[in-house]
Interface confidence: low
């Protein structure tokens, strides 16, 4: 009867350097003897060499020389008594493309090279990007931990080395960024930033990386109100807005944020719970009244916090003259004469190019002024 | 400085052997994986051979295979490739290339001329 | 083996001329690819790598772009000293390959 050596092993296998991959393998060999139970041995060689002499690739016989190049990245899996002979090839080295076969070893009578079942190894180079895992959200302000994996490497061969870089990173403190987890406190000015998490073998030529762009929450910390595309000067959370009355006005609120916060314009200065004349963040009013003068609050409400302005509109209005009109009366002529602006204006009356003011005496000459707004009386 | 320098190249007869030398200095040797790369007379460039820095893995060009041998002395700073069974066709310039980043071959050697002709 | 194909052989230009140079790759090489300069008589010299990445030294009128399959190697201003030979290699699969070059000469 044929002796039956039979290997089950896939005949190619595909990894890209620096990566790791299992080589799923299980083998059957003639073995009858009941009255003794030498120990037995397999063995990975590289194709083309000769079983007696070179060194192999992985074994499990502690006298076997195993060579440098794969000691500790080539290893056997499994119970190689229940017929396991599954490798494990850990940091995928360019070198390692090639053949390989399997050999049995079992007392005097089982020695055997399964040279018809060969691996085929083929080591590509390394397109596989590592991951960044954000374990909570970023907020400005707040700590968080990120953390940066090659998905497919293993424990062996040399250690991995990281790198980080990004604007959101602090330059002053280098070896925080030399590691494979990294403690990130964002600024508002960080969102959108790329954040680049850079891999390396050591001892190896070719690094991996991955970028990301953060995306930052943050609270607004700045309002500002465009006039026909023209900011607003801002003094202490108030903005002043001198305006024409009956002038049509278009005012838009602008309160940078991640994610955008919900913009809204209330009259005057609103109470928290106030109803909005405006659900966004532009206010029109199709004609402006002297009645608005008190003004309008732009309010940005966001998860992380609110901030508001103040709009102080001065409403103001060219002057219309009633006047003047004078008429003889017991004490002798009286003329009277009305403005009607706001401010309210002042009125002087002219003799012979003299001014009279206010309230005043000059001669025979007298004069009543009031100003109640937006009239302004003179007679 | 970075340098590497051939030599050994020269007038062989077909079937004949010769082998050549490459001296690196300026870097730590061992670090680096090392190639033998040809130009045959007006032609392009073409990879014929590469070994990794311990010199435990080898490899070769499909038409070099089994006649040319490439080995590294790492305590002498030295690569070698011995060219047996020469062909007409083996005849060019032999550059030893250094392995830069991205597998590229950042440094190279001046290049030894090496004619195959009866 | 992975086959590399330059274009064009052979192009004629004059100093100042901005010149472009291809490559394409039988199968997809991510970014595995390098450029080289070779003037008669002398070694390559490496100019690019990694598709996108100027070698330290080299100038930055040389720019390398593409990803995949595709590769351009870019001259923004043409001077007297890059008249030479032009080859990418793919260094993405063993064995290494190269292209057939591009030999720029003067108009």
């Known amino acids: 009867e044929k002796p039956v050596y039979e290997l089950q092993v896939q005949k190619s296998v595909t990894v890209q350097e620096g990566l790791c991959v299992l080589v799923p393998c299980s083998f059957s060999y003639p073995w009858r003897s009941w009255y003794s139970s030498p120990p037995l041995y397999v063995y990975w060689f590289r194709d083309g060499e000769i079983p007696y002499y070179a060194e192999v690739v992985a074994t499990n016989n502690p006298d076997r020389r195993v060579k440098p190049e794969t000691q500790g990245r080539f290893r056997l899996l499994g119970d190689v008594q229940k017929k396991n002979c599954s490798l494990s090839i850990g940091d995928a080295r360019m070198e390692d493309t090639g053949s390989y076969f399997f050999r049995v070893e079992r007392g005097r009578d089982v020695k055997y090279s399964y040279q018809q079942n060969k691996l085929n190894l083929e080591v590509t180079a390394l397109i596989e990007k590592p991951d960044i895992h954000f374990l909570e959200p970023l907020e400005s302000g707040r700590p968080t931990r990120l953390s940066c994996s090659l998905p497919g490497s293993c424990e062996a061969g040399p250690p991995l080395t990281f790198s980080w870089t990004g604007n959101a990173l602090s330059p002053l403190d280098p070896e925080t960024t030399r590691s494979s987890e990294l403690t990130l406190t964002p600024r508002p000015e960080d969102h959108g930033t790329n954040l680049t998490c850079q891999m390396k073998r050591q001892g190896a030529q070719v690094t991996t990386e991955r970028t990301v762009q953060l995306n930052v929450s943050y609270a607004p910390q700045t309002i500002t109100i465009f006039r026909n595309g023209i900011a607003l000067e801002i003094l202490q959370n108030t903005s002043y807005l001198p305006v024409l009355e009956g002038q049509a006005l278009r005012l838009l609120c602008d309160a940078p944020s991640n994610p955008p916060a919900h913009l809204s314009w209330f009259q005057g200065s609103p109470a928290l719970n106030a109803t909005p004349i405006s659900n966004t963040g532009i206010l029109e009013l199709r004609r402006v009244r002297s009645a608005e003068k008190g003004g309008f609050t732009c309010r940005a409400q966001h998860p992380l916090g609110f901030l508001q302005i103040f709009l102080n509109l001065s409403v103001y209005s060219l002057p219309q003259l009633l006047g003047p009109s004078c008429s003889w009366e017991a004490e002798g002529l009286h003329c009277r004469c009305s403005f009607r602006a706001w401010p309210a204006p002042s009125l002087c009356w002219r003799l012979e190019e003299k001014p009279l003011e206010g309230n005043s005496s000059q001669g025979s000459f007298k004069v009543n002024s009031s100003s109640p707004g937006p009239w302004a009386n003179s007679s | 400085e970075v340098q590497l320098l051939e030599s050994g190249g020269g007038l062989v007869q077909p079937g004949g052997s010769l082998r050549l030398s490459c001296a690196a200095s300026g870097f730590t040797f061992n670090y680096y994986a090392l190639s033998w790369v040809r130009q045959a007379p007006g032609k392009g460039l073409e990879w014929v051979s590469g070994?990794?820095?311990?010199?435990?893995?080898?490899f070769y060009a499909d038409s070099v295979k089994g006649r040319f041998t490439i080995s590294r002395d790492n305590s002498k700073n030295t690569l070698y490739l011995q060219m047996n069974s020469l062909r007409a066709e083996d005849t060019a310039v032999y550059y030893c290339a250094r392995r830069g980043g991205w597998y590229s071959f950042d440094i190279w050697g001046q290049g030894t001329l090496v004619t195959v002709s009866s | 083996d992975i086959q590399m194909t330059q274009s064009p052989s052979t192009l004629s230009a004059y100093v100042g001329d901005r010149v472009t140079i291809t490559c394409r790759a039988s199968?997809?090489?991510?970014?595995?690819l390098n450029w080289y300069q070779q003037k008669p008589g002398k070694a390559p010299k490496l100019l690019i790598y990694s598709a996108s990445s100027l070698q330290s030294g080299v100038p930055s009128r040389f720019s390398g772009s593409g990803s995949g399959t595709d590769f351009t190697l870019t001259i923004s201003s043409l001077q007297p000293e890059d008249f030479a030979t032009y080859y990418c290699q793919q260094s993405f699969s063993a064995p290494d390959t190269f292209g057939g070059g591009t030999k720029v000469e003067i108009k």
């Open positions: 199968q997809i090489i991510s970014t595995y």
């Open positions: 070994i990794s820095g311990s010199g435990g893995t080898t």
